[in-house]
């Protein structure tokens, strides 16, 4: 008795975070024996879509010509071979930006900060939101989510950093969102350049670059330090 068919690989191109109105392609890669591919979306009737394989049959393409709220969500894919259906792929979370107006990102007291001092990045939305994400350019993931404890709506979230080092220098953006769908984000804020001066650690890197360490920093969240903000939001480290 053969074991279960290996799970396929699922990914989105050009990426999994897509602006409203832009196109996205979802790829499901299985084996050369695949006869059919199926894409399921969480909380939607299954199958969400079916596709015949592309030659040489080891993958299928699912095209979304224009990203909207309806396409945001969590997907899995399967393939069918002569011996049956495969295991499900690992999930793909497709996020849409542009669902809400962009928040404003500022630095208090200033975006020019001396190494060793404190700075707070403040993300403010025009309408009340319950989730805020801080993104650093050249980071693979959000630095952190701040999410309200009990669904309380907030106009802002604070991201304190103390003490600041050269690692904190760089370009930041923030997003806001409603908790009912973390697959829908606002437009990104305008970028904020945080410049760290007077570093004691040696030469400061270019402000738009992360500092390299053995751990591969550009894939690792950069954790702002300090106390939990007073806004009633709770930290969710990514």
């Amino acid at each position: 008795q053969a074991g279960p068919l290996p799970k396929p690989t699922l990914w989105a191109e050009p990426g999994s975070v897509i602006s409203w109105g832009n196109s996205v392609t979802i790829w499901c890669q299985g084996t050369l024996e695949a006869r059919e591919y199926r894409l399921d979306k969480e909380e939607s009737p299954a199958p969400w879509d079916r596709q015949n394989p592309l030659e040489p049959k080891n993958k299928a393409r699912f095209s979304i010509p224009s990203m909207t709220e309806d396409y945001a969500g969590r997907y899995r894919c399967y393939y069918r071979s002569p011996v049956g259906w495969s295991q499900p792929s690992d999930p793909l979370e497709l996020v849409m930006t542009g669902a809400y107006s962009k928040p404003t990102l500022s630095a208090l007291p200033s975006p020019l900060v001396t190494s060793g001092k404190s700075v707070t990045l403040l993300c403010q939305s025009r309408s009340p939101m319950d989730t805020f994400l801080l993104i650093k350019e050249r980071a693979a993931h959000p630095l952190l989510h701040l999410r309200s404890e009990h669904g309380a709506q907030q106009h802002q979230a604070e991201f304190p950093m103390s003490p600041v080092t050269s690692v904190h220098g760089g370009t930041y953006r923030c997003f806001s969102s409603h908790g009912f769908s973390h697959y829908l984000l606002s437009h990104p804020s305008d970028p904020l350049e945080l410049i760290v001066s007077g570093s004691l650690e040696g030469p400061r890197p270019s402000p738009t670059r992360s500092v390299s360490t053995a751990a591969g920093p550009e894939d690792q969240p950069l954790m702002p330090t300090g106390s939990v903000p007073h806004s009633g939001l709770r930290r969710h480290w990514e």
């Epitope: 990914w11 191109e13 050009p14 196109s23 350019e137 993931h141 591969g216």
Partner: antibody
Framework: QVQLQESGPGLVKPSETLSLTCTVS????????WSWIRQPPGKGLEWIGY???????NYKPSLKSRVTISVDTSKNQFSLKLTSVTAADTAVYYC???????????????WGQGTLVTVSS | DIQMTQSPSSLSASVGDRVTITCRAS??????LAWYQQKPGKVPKLLIY???TLQSGVPSRFSGSGSGTDFTLTISSLQPEDVATYYC?????????FGQGTKLEIK
């Protein structure tokens, strides 16, 4: 700062297999797309294919039957194999990468220095 | 598959001139277009992504515009160090494709 370095033989015989490896340093390979691009002498850039960090691949259709790109996350490397080479495959071969998530895109902002591979008997 | 066509294939301009290079996609690609600069004997360098976003460290005399099928790279005031071949590349969905290149020279 992420750096990419190609390695492999500079001379390959016709009908044999061209094998190149790209080593990624200064960061983890486990994020986003890693590509191979080539440039024949005096000509333009030609995209060969990419591998997504989870193993998903896409290749240029005209090369698909001869190309395999694979990734070894434990060694922070990805590799190119091109079978049945001819003189037309003589080119500078570049590895390149795009590693980010939240401005999720496939453009290439990390490049290796390139390695010239000559196909000749 | 989507084809990318650049024009002109070569051009010669004077220092200080405004230079425009165009790239046309055979089908719509949203704003998923990048521009690269390759100086003679050097590795290609990313200039612009998402059609109009300037890569960090690239001089502000470079700009990009367009969406859908028609895109433009503009150098507002040509400098001697801008002598290079410029390539557009689409990355909305595989196969990624480069334009054939535009060779820029100084008069």
């Amino acid at each position: 700062q992420v750096q990419l370095q190609e390695s492999g033989p500079g001379l390959v015989k016709p009908s044999e297999t061209l094998s190149l490896t790209c080593t990624v340093s200064g960061g983890s390979i486990s994020s986003h797309y890693w590509s191979w691009i080539r440039q024949p002498p005096g000509k333009g850039l030609e995209w060969i294919g990419y591998i997504y960090y989870n193993g998903g691949t896409n290749y240029k259709p005209s090369l698909k039957s001869r190309v395999t790109i694979s990734v070894d996350t434990s060694k922070n490397q990805f590799s190119l194999k091109l079978t049945s080479v001819t003189a037309a495959d003589t080119a500078v071969y570049y590895c390149a990468g795009r590693r980010y998530y939240y401005d999720s895109s496939g453009y290439l902002d990390y490049w290796g220095q390139g390695t010239l591979v000559t196909v000749s008997s | 598959d989507i084809q990318m066509t650049q024009s002109p294939s070569s051009l010669s301009a004077s220092v200080g001139d405004r230079v425009t290079i165009t790239c046309r996609a055979s089908q719509g690609i949203s704003n998923y277009l990048a521009w690269y600069q390759q100086k003679p004997g050097k590795v290609p360098k990313l200039l612009i992504y998402a059609a109009s976003t300037l890569q960090s460290g690239v001089p502000s005399r470079f700009s990009g515009s367009g969406s859908g099928t028609d895109f433009t790279l503009t150098i507002s005031s040509l400098q001697p160090e801008d002598v290079a071949t410029y390539y557009c590349q689409k990355y909305n969905s595989a196969p990624w494709t480069f334009g054939q290149g535009t060779k820029l020279e100084i008069k």
